[in-house]
C-alpha cells in the first residue's frame, strides 16, 4: 500500500500505487479527512484536500474516497472499485501534508 | 473565522425527544466531520456521534438506538436528535468540528436538563 | 471498546515547575492520541494532536510524547493560566475520552 505526492515534498499531485502502476485519485467527494489518511500514510499529521489539481497522466485509480478521517490507510476507505471512475486527469485531487 | 454554536431548549421532560442545531461559519460542512460531545454536570466528556462525508453517521455504540444526525448543508447546519431522554441525559451539550478525529474547534455549549 | 486511564487525577503543582501528566491505553492506539485543556464554564481545547503536534495557537511549553499505549503530556514552565482540566483522547478506535487530571496551583 504505497502513495506519493507528485509536485512538491508535502503539496502536489496525490497519487497511489496500484497493480504495479501509479495512478492518481479523482476530486470526486474528496475532502480533508481523505487528504488526511493519505498524508498519514506518508508519516504526516494532518492533510488539506485540494480539488483539480489535475497534471496527473494514465490511469485514474480511485473516485468518490469517503475516509472517516481515522483509518490507517486509504485502501481501508469507502470507494469506487480500483479504476472505475467518471472523470478526467483535470479533476485529479491534490493535497496538502503537514 | 471558525465558529460553531449549540442551539434548543434548555429543559427537557423524561421520555421526550431532544433536538439540537449546530450552527457553523467559516468552514464547509462537507470539508469537515461534524461531531457531538456531551459532559454531564462535574463528569468528564463523552462523544456521542459524527456526522461526516457523504452524509455518513458515526454513533457512540451505547446511544446508537436513541439517536440521529443529519445535517443541511445549505444552513450550514447540522441536528441532533435523542429521544427517550433520562435524567442521566442532562449535560452539556457540545458541537465541535473533527478532522482526522481530532476536535480542532467547539461550540461554547448548551447546558440541557431533563427534568419534570 | 478501549479504555483510557489518566494519572494523577489531581495535580497540584506550583508557577515554574515542570509538570508531567500520564495517560494510558489498554491496547495499542497508534499515535492517535490527543491532548484537550478545559478551564472552569468553558468548552475544552485542542492542545496536543496526534500523539506530538502542537495545535496552532498553543504555546511551546505544552507538548506531547508517547506511543503504542503510553502517552504524556508535558508542560515545561507551569503558568497561573494552567490551572485546567486536562483529557486525554483516542481515535484509533471507537473514540473516547480519559477521565481527566485537574491541575491545581499549590
Known amino acids: 500500500q504505497r502513495v506519493r505526492i507528485m509536485g512538491g515534498t508535502n503539496r502536489g499531485r496525490a497519487e497511489v500505487y496500484y497493480n504495479n502502476e501509479w495512478g492518481t485519485i479523482c476530486d470526486d467527494d474528496w475532502d480533508n479527512n481523505d487528504a488526511t489518511v493519505f498524508c498519514r500514510m506518508l508519516g504526516y499529521s494532518r492533510g488539506r484536500a485540494l480539488s483539480s489539481y489535475g497534471g496527473g497522466s494514465g490511469n485514474i485509480w480511485l473516485d468518490n474516497v469517503n475516509c472517516r478521517g481515522t483509518e490507517n490507510s486509504l485502501w481501508d476507505c469507502s470507494k469506487n472499485s480500483w479504476g472505475n471512475h467518471n472523470c478526467v486527469h483535470n479533476e485529479d485531487a491534490g493535497v496538502e501534508c503537514s | 473565522q471558525v465558529q460553531l454554536k449549540e442551539s434548543g431548549p434548555g429543559l427537557v421532560q423524561p421520555s421526550q425527544t431532544l433536538s439540537l442545531t449546530c450552527t457553523v461559519s467559516g468552514f464547509s460542512l462537507t470539508s469537515y466531520t461534524l461531531s457531538w460531545v456531551r459532559q454531564p454536570p462535574g463528569k468528564g466528556l463523552e462523544w456521542i456521534g459524527a456526522?461526516?462525508?457523504?452524509?455518513?453517521?458515526d454513533y457512540n455504540s451505547a446511544l446508537k438506538s436513541r439517536l440521529s444526525i443529519s445535517r443541511d448543508t445549505s444552513k450550514s447546519q447540522v441536528l441532533l436528535k435523542m429521544n427517550s431522554l433520562q435524567t442521566e441525559d442532562t449535560a452539556i451539550y457540545f458541537c465541535?468540528?473533527?478532522?482526522?478525529?481530532?476536535?480542532?474547534?467547539w461550540g461554547q455549549g448548551v447546558m440541557v436538563t431533563v427534568s419534570s | 471498546d478501549i479504555q483510557m486511564t489518566q494519572s494523577p487525577p489531581v495535580l497540584s503543582a506550583s508557577v515554574g515547575d515542570r509538570v508531567t501528566l500520564s495517560c494510558k491505553t489498554s491496547?495499542?492506539?497508534?499515535?492517535?492520541l490527543d491532548w484537550y485543556q478545559q478551564k472552569h464554564g468553558e468548552a475544552p481545547k485542542l492542545l496536543i494532536y496526534y500523539t506530538n503536534n502542537l495545535q496552532t495557537g498553543i504555546p511551546s511549553r505544552f507538548s506531547g510524547s508517547g506511543s503504542g499505549t503510553d502517552f504524556t503530556l508535558t508542560i515545561s514552565t507551569l503558568q497561573p493560566e494552567d490551572v485546567a482540566t486536562y483529557y486525554c483522547y483516542q481515535y484509533d478506535s471507537g473514540f473516547t475520552f480519559g477521565a481527566g487530571t485537574k491541575l491545581e496551583l499549590k
Open positions: 456526522i461526516w462525508g457523504g452524509d455518513n453517521t
Open positions: 491496547q495499542n492506539i497508534n499515535k492517535k
Open positions: 465541535t468540528r473533527e478532522l482526522g478525529g481530532s476536535f480542532d474547534y
